[in-house]
């Protein structure tokens, strides 16, 4: 852009110099030219030389007028035609912007990733605004009426350190530009019921020989939390339906999940846990292959009415991803149980 | 209690600088979100910039690029380095708690003076 320009005159620019995209736009340039009365003042955008909407205003100024201006940044310059001299002169320049005042922050959420030492606060920040849009993050005491505030660009990250006083804050974002200011709705928090236990891995599979075999999964997490809710998903690599089975884990010791599988066909695995009664989730862990040994005798394989389902497991589900290219957004489409109770409602964010 | 005392204002030519202080005493000032507000004669409170706890930076449009605030936890002071002073800038200048915001909490304040 043009920011450090000797100017031998002015320009400006009504309404500003950063407006609301779609308004109509006065640009004006008065020169203050030695030993020159100009026959003609153009305008350039971008450094191309503007034919229409130009009027002379008197022997010092003149105007370029934009209807509905929608670029989100430009760069203006004038000219003056000097008599005598071959080429034009410059008289000044300046950077113009066009945008949106911000949408209010929404879908506010607070997360401690276990051992991270920060509560990292995301949020949608809805349309975009084209120009420089910054996020103050409000952490507010409940407990001591303290407030702190963090300035962001998307995401925030507040080390727990600095949250000692309390264990029970509001937080809230404040969206700020030149054309406006907009505030989130304000979130509860409460630091013991944020936190997502550390990383669940898969480790291994394997299949046994047995006359009908089964698949067992190895997985593990670091996580000191004592009280872990986990879902597995798996399906084929040719499918897009996959299978949700539900544990209580307990990550003193390797788990240990049984499956009873498609005989040759390759599978894949995932996992995630939270606490057990918290909402937040892990992300779904990288996905794990396993191929099922071959069997002698093949038998007509049905998931949903065979015996070889483990039934120990608390709930079967069906869930369908939406595109093979997106495995990772799911959609719940039926839940089979197999212990009595229904699904856990968590599944809505599968993905 | 919370007190803020503003000093460094002075009077200088367009195109000067200054150094603004602000001393803080009476809250954990390292983890306070600190603002600089002015107010030009006869003109309405004008944010000016804001800074947080661990550094980032705001600026009015009118300040960017010629204004720099800034903060030392070790003085509990906080700061604004005034460049290329333009005779708008004319104002009393003072500190408050928080990034943002069109208000201040009734400390003195500082002068400055920018005459072409």
């Known amino acids: 852009g043009i920011t450090s320009i000797n100017c031998s005159g002015d320009m400006w620019v009504e309404p500003g110099e950063i407006f609301q995209m779609g308004m109509n736009v006065s640009i004006y340039c008065q020169e203050a030219l030695k030993h020159c009365r100009p026959r003609n003042l153009y305008f350039y955008k971008n450094g191309f030389k503007e034919e229409f909407d130009i009027t002379r205003i008197n022997r010092t100024t003149a105007r370029i007028w934009y209807k509905g201006f929608s670029e989100p940044h430009a760069y203006m310059h004038c000219t003056a035609e000097c008599p005598g001299h071959f080429q034009e002169t410059l008289i000044c320049g300046k950077d113009i912007s066009s945008g949106h005042p911000p949408d209010a922050p929404s879908n506010l959420t607070c997360v401690i990733y276990e051992y991270s030492g920060n509560m990292t606060c995301t949020w949608n920040t809805g349309k975009p605004t084209y120009i420089d849009t910054k996020y103050i993050v409000h952490v507010k005491s409940l407990e001591t009426e303290e407030e702190q505030q963090y300035l962001a660009s998307s995401y925030v990250k507040i080390s727990t350190d600095s949250l000692q006083g309390s264990r029970k804050y509001l937080v809230w974002v404040q969206a700020v530009n030149s054309l406006g200011m907009e505030n989130s709705q304000q979130l509860h928090v409460h630091l013991d019921d944020i936190v997502i236990p550390s990383a669940s891995i898969i480790s291994r599979a394997e299949t046994t020989n047995d006359t009908v075999p089964k698949t067992i999964v190895y997985w593990k997490s670091k996580t000191m939390i004592e009280k872990v809710f986990c879902e597995m998903r798996y399906k084929t690599t040719t499918n897009q339906t996959w299978s949700v089975k539900e544990f209580d884990a307990n990550f003193t010791y390797v788990q240990q999940s049984e499956f009873y599988l498609e005989p040759d066909s390759k599978y894949v695995f995932q996992v995630r846990c939270q606490e057990t009664g918290k909402r937040n989730w892990q992300p779904w862990s990288s996905p794990f292959v396993h191929q099922t040994s071959q069997e002698t005798g093949k038998r007509n394989w049905q998931p949903w009415s065979s015996p070889f389902v483990h039934q120990t497991s608390q709930t079967v589900s069906q869930v369908t991803a939406k595109s093979s290219h997106e495995p990772q957004k799911m959609e719940m489409l039926s839940a089979t149980i197999f212990r009595g109770h229904p699904a856990s409602g968590n599944h809505q964010d599968i993905g | 209690q919370v007190q803020l005392q503003e000093s460094g204002g002075g009077s200088v030519q367009a195109g000067g600088s200054l150094r603004l202080s602000c001393a803080a005493s009476?809250?954990?000032?390292?983890?306070?979100?600190m603002r600089w507000v002015r107010q030009a004669p006869g003109k309405g409170l004008e944010w000016v910039s804001g800074?947080?706890?661990?550094?980032?930076?705001i600026y009015a449009d009118s300040v960017k690029g010629r204004f720099t605030i800034s903060k030392d936890n070790a003085k509990n002071t906080l700061y604004l380095q005034l460049n290329s002073l333009k005779t708008e800038d004319t104002a009393m200048y003072y500190c408050?708690?928080?990034?943002?915001?069109?208000?201040?909490?009734g400390s003195q304040g500082t002068q400055v003076t920018v005459s072409s």
């Open positions: 800074i947080d706890s661990r550094g980032s930076t």
């Open positions: 408050a708690q928080g990034v943002y915001g069109d208000t201040y909490s």
């Open positions: 009476g809250f954990t000032f390292r983890l306070t979100a």
